[in-house]
């Protein structure tokens, strides 16, 4: 029988009559055109629709969109198209939603060919309602909030301007023209790349990187030869064109520009590209794209000034056609990541670190789960899971990994169990202690979704027919009810519920269709009833984030520290609540080489958790770039993980001395970096 | 081997207090928790609460909750349970028991290694 | 909390016997149950958990099964060293003790 459906599994009781209380339908009243929806704030219940239905004519496409509001989850929707003067709204732009609960919305619409401007609509009482702006400009960009103040906000124009508003757009000036690409740092900083000559295209490598930090009042130029920069963590990066070819290198910066540092990453070439993983306040994930069409590169892990960079993994998936990878970040675990490598006989297979990238192994077989037939041996063989790269080759996969902060532990995915990705038609399993172990949890393809911090588990089957039930979990996945939602099948096109996975309400989303007509239909569903009672204290139980090895007197220890947390027991059927937090417990550990990552020079043989030089390297001096010095590195081979807590135990130590000569790299240097005023 | 020593036998006044103590040697003490469970006479076995070493997480059992205090010291790597307002009720044979753990789960495992129980008597 | 409940609370057997004992708990407990066996004057010993792992060093005469809120533990051949009293214990929730079978010579 398929997971959970036996007859021993814990039913929830009366459980249909309390769903069926709770369950909430709405038909849009529209033509099926496309449909996109947009929680709005924290924990208001606010919900914007917008439906749109395009009209191909022989000249332009003509449009009608609709808008519509709920404020209660979902349960209700109000249609205020009138609102945007029924204006149709172009989808590209999406619904421009404001930081944490400003209530600020930013909708950008279709207009006439002549105009001299874009129009957009404007609200910041959570969509109750809206201004209309007409724009100085034609945006090509989606209206950028900044992180700090919501007021302001900044857009890209057709003709490559970069326009900024300090009163949430309602006035608008130009600040710079030529403008490629354009993000907000910290603290209302704006960084830029700009051209001067040609356009984006024709001038990339010779771009130059530009900061405000007074809104455009004054700028300052940070680098030169620029192809391209991000932001992540606390790290500014930058690709710089090389003097003497077209290679490229990346430069780091930690003070938002005012200094840089060469990576010790490899240069790369034309059709070679550098990806941020992930990035944090403490390190950075750098993908390093192989030379050649291969679709696999490496993975490097920086230390805490994103300057050296160990190798993490070889041979790491990503696509230079469609740009997929499937790196995952498991949020509910903390040093775990999940992605793709390509083996050398071009099968694809899941790797996962619980270090931070320290080391990467197989995930392990699920239990009760035979191989498959891209098993070699049908004893050993380990998980595989479908992310990113499966779904944009059309597999049968609804979804990518899901895992959320506040649910602990857990990890749900569509996966085989082979000895590669297979093609066959794949299961959905779940793993309640971060990656480390796994169980099938449903057979065949599933829309799944996480509510009250783990609480419920909700999923429905991923098929071409229309469907009207619905299949939920109140013990992280073991055992499953089923409730009929509708007598009606629906095409089922998308379970919706409020990011954070806080919420006990989820949206069911889909259309039907009759002869003459066919209509939007949402059923919201609340499960409050379910879960009938506040979690109390007997509810949870103490468990030790990874765990291997309870002899081990360092056992769980990951960074330095390890964790203890409260979690709720499976057999528990409670609300966590959305005031839920999770209680956690993190006490240091003693440092071993573990601890250490391998500095510039130095790797790590497989299976060894020493340090040793790197052959090529045996006798020479380590040179490298920092802050546009050369330094000279005296090391025995180790530096510390970043975020790496431990104390005392094994400590190789490391220094860097000052050589005063200055760097071979075409970048700037502070003193050749300039201030411009408005 | 991992043993559980117990402290040896009591004899108490009504409304008095006793301390067990539960001291483990040959094993790693701190990375399992340490439940208590009492056994009166000719009657079965009744969970008090436990701890878990690290962090000094305890729970209790309803029943004894705000009667019984259970500590852990990872120095020596031992175990206290205090009982106070004793009763002739509470007249057992109090053992201590190692949780089994194959996962970072505490308390999911049994209780693999046991102490030799300690007889507290309550009377007056 | 969860309640065990455990039968027979006495169980009349002999050498060689297959035997049998049950416990059912309030609530789904998924697998998180163990069985103990305890003898006069000595400490309880662990026998299964998880439902139905055996312990090491248990011999294989004894096995478990169950799962939810319906739990067995089986005595495939009864020994002359299996008459004791046996317990199953609950894990999932707060630590509950079924009330005991006890196993003595027919």
């Known amino acids: 029988s398929a997971p959970g459906e036996d007859e021993e599994c814990g039913r929830v009781r009366d459980f249909v009559a309390k769903l069926a209380n709770n369950t909430h339908q709405h038909v849009f009243d529209d033509l099926r055109g496309s449909v996109s929806l947009s929680w709005v704030g924290d924990s208001t219940g606010v919900i914007l629709v917008l439906t749109t239905f395009h009209v191909p004519l022989v000249i332009m496409t003509f449009g009608q969109s609709k808008l519509y509001r709920s404020e209660d989850y979902g349960k209700n929707f109000k249609d205020i198209t009138d609102l945007i003067n029924n204006t149709f709204i172009r989808t590209e732009f999406g619904m421009a939603i404001g930081p944490e609960n400003s209530g600020k919305v930013v909708l950008t619409a279709e207009v006439s060919g002549g105009s001299r401007g874009g129009r957009i609509f404007r609200s910041s009482d959570f969509a109750k309602n809206f201004v209309q702006t007409d724009l100085p400009f034609h945006p090509l960009t989606q209206m950028m909030y900044s992180p700090q103040n919501s007021d302001y906000l900044l857009a890209l124009s057709t003709e490559n301007g970069l326009w900024v508003s300090k009163n949430f757009g309602g006035k608008w000036e130009e600040i710079h023209k030529a403008v490629c690409l354009a993000k907000w740092g910290s603290d209302n900083t704006i960084f830029f790349t700009t051209y001067a000559n040609g356009s984006c295209k024709a001038d990339l490598g010779a771009l130059e990187l530009w900061r405000t930090s007074d809104l455009g009042k004054s700028f300052k130029t940070i680098g030169v030869k620029i192809y391209s920069f991000g932001l992540g963590g606390r790290f500014l990066f930058a690709s710089v064109m090389a003097d003497k070819d077209t290679t490229r290198r990346i430069h780091v910066s930690t003070d938002q520009g005012d200094t840089w540092s060469m990576a010790q990453l490899p240069s790369v070439g034309q059709e070679q590209f550098y990806s941020i993983l992930a990035a944090n306040d403490d390190m950075v994930f750098m993908h390093v794209d192989e030379p050649g069409d291969t679709g696999f590169g490496t993975i490097f892990t920086s230390d805490d000034r994103g300057i050296v960079y160990s190798k993490s993994l070889d041979r790491h998936l990503y696509t230079t056609t469609g740009g997929e990878t499937d790196f995952t970040n498991v949020t509910s675990l903390r040093g775990v990541y999940i992605t793709s490598v390509l083996s050398e006989d071009n099968s694809i297979q899941t790797m996962i670190t619980f270090d931070q990238g320290g080391r990467w192994t197989h995930l392990r077989k699920p239990e009760n789960s035979e191989c498959d037939a891209t098993a070699k041996n049908k004893n050993e063989c380990s998980l595989h899971i479908h992310a990113s790269y499966s779904i944009s080759q059309k597999l049968n996969v609804p979804m990518a990994p899901l895992s959320e902060p506040n649910a602990v532990g857990i990890v749900i995915a569509h996966g085989s169990v082979g000895d590669a990705i297979s093609v066959m038609v794949p299961d959905v399993y779940i793993s309640d202690d971060g990656g480390y172990s796994w169980t099938k949890m449903l057979e065949g393809p599933h829309y799944y979704t996480i509510l009250d911090s783990g609480g419920i588990i909700v999923a429905i089957e991923h098929s071409s027919r229309p469907i009207n039930v619905i299949k939920f979990s109140t013990d992280e996945g073991q055992c499953w009810q089923t409730y009929t939602f509708t007598r009606d099948p629906i095409y089922f096109t998308g379970l919706a519920s409020e990011p954070g996975a806080r919420s006990m309400n989820i949206s069911i989303w889909g259309f039907t269709e009759s002869f003459a007509t066919s209509q939007w239909v949402s059923y919201t569903i609340d499960f409050k009833d379910i879960l009938e009672r506040n979690c109390e204290e007997k509810d949870y139980t103490i468990w030790l984030a990874h765990s291997t090895d309870p002899e081990d007197y360092e056992d769980g220890c990951i960074l330095g520290y390890k964790e203890q947390f409260l979690r709720l027991r499976k057999s528990s059927v409670c609300q966590n609540g959305r005031d839920y937090v999770v209680t956690k417990q993190p006490s240091i550990c003693l440092c071993s080489l573990e601890d250490f990552l391998c500095d510039f020079g130095y790797y790590r043989p497989e299976n060894d958790s020493k340090c040793v030089e790197q052959p090529e390297l045996k006798g020479h001096d380590l040179e490298f770039c920092l802050y546009g010095r050369e330094e000279h590195l005296t090391t025995n081979g180790y530096r510390k993980i970043p975020g790496d807590k431990c104390q005392g135990g094994v400590n190789p130590v490391r220094e860097v001395k000052d050589l005063k000569k200055k760097c071979t790299s075409n970048f700037l240097s502070p003193e050749k970096q300039n201030s411009k005023s408005n | 081997q991992v043993q559980l020593v117990q402290s040896g036998a009591e004899v108490k006044k009504p409304g008095s207090s006793v301390k067990v103590s539960c001291k483990a040697s040959?094993?790693?003490?701190?990375?399992?928790?340490i439940s208590w469970v009492r056994q009166a006479p000719g009657q079965g076995l009744e969970w008090m609460g436990g701890?878990?070493?690290?962090?000094?997480?305890?729970n209790y059992a309803q029943k004894f909750q705000g009667r019984v205090t259970i500590t852990a010291d990872e120095s020596t790597s031992t175990a206290y349970m205090e009982l106070s307002s004793l009763r002739s009720e509470d007249t057992a044979v109090y053992y201590c028991?190692?949780?089994?753990?194959?996962?970072?789960?505490?308390?999911?495992?049994?209780?693999?290694?046991w102490g030799q129980g300690t007889t507290v008597t309550v009377s007056s | 909390d969860i309640q065990m409940t455990q039968s027979p609370s006495t169980l009349s057997a002999s050498v060689g016997d297959r035997v049998t004992i049950t416990c059912r708990a309030s609530q789904s407990i998924s697998s998180w149950l163990a069985w103990y066996q305890q003898k006069p004057g000595k400490a309880p010993k662990l026998l299964i958990y998880k439902a139905s792992s055996l312990e090491s060093g248990v011999p294989s005469r004894f096995s478990g099964s169950g799962s939810g809120t319906e739990f067995t533990l089986t005595i495939s051949s009864l020994q002359p060293d299996d008459f004791a009293t046996y317990y199953c214990q609950q894990a999932d929730g707060h630590i509950t003790f079924g009330g005991g079978t006890k196993v003595e010579i027919k």
């Open positions: 040959g094993g790693t003490f701190r990375n399992y928790a």
């Open positions: 701890i878990i070493p690290i962090g000094g997480w305890a």
């Open positions: 028991a190692r949780q089994g753990r194959k996962t970072g789960y505490y308390y999911y495992y049994g209780m693999d290694v």
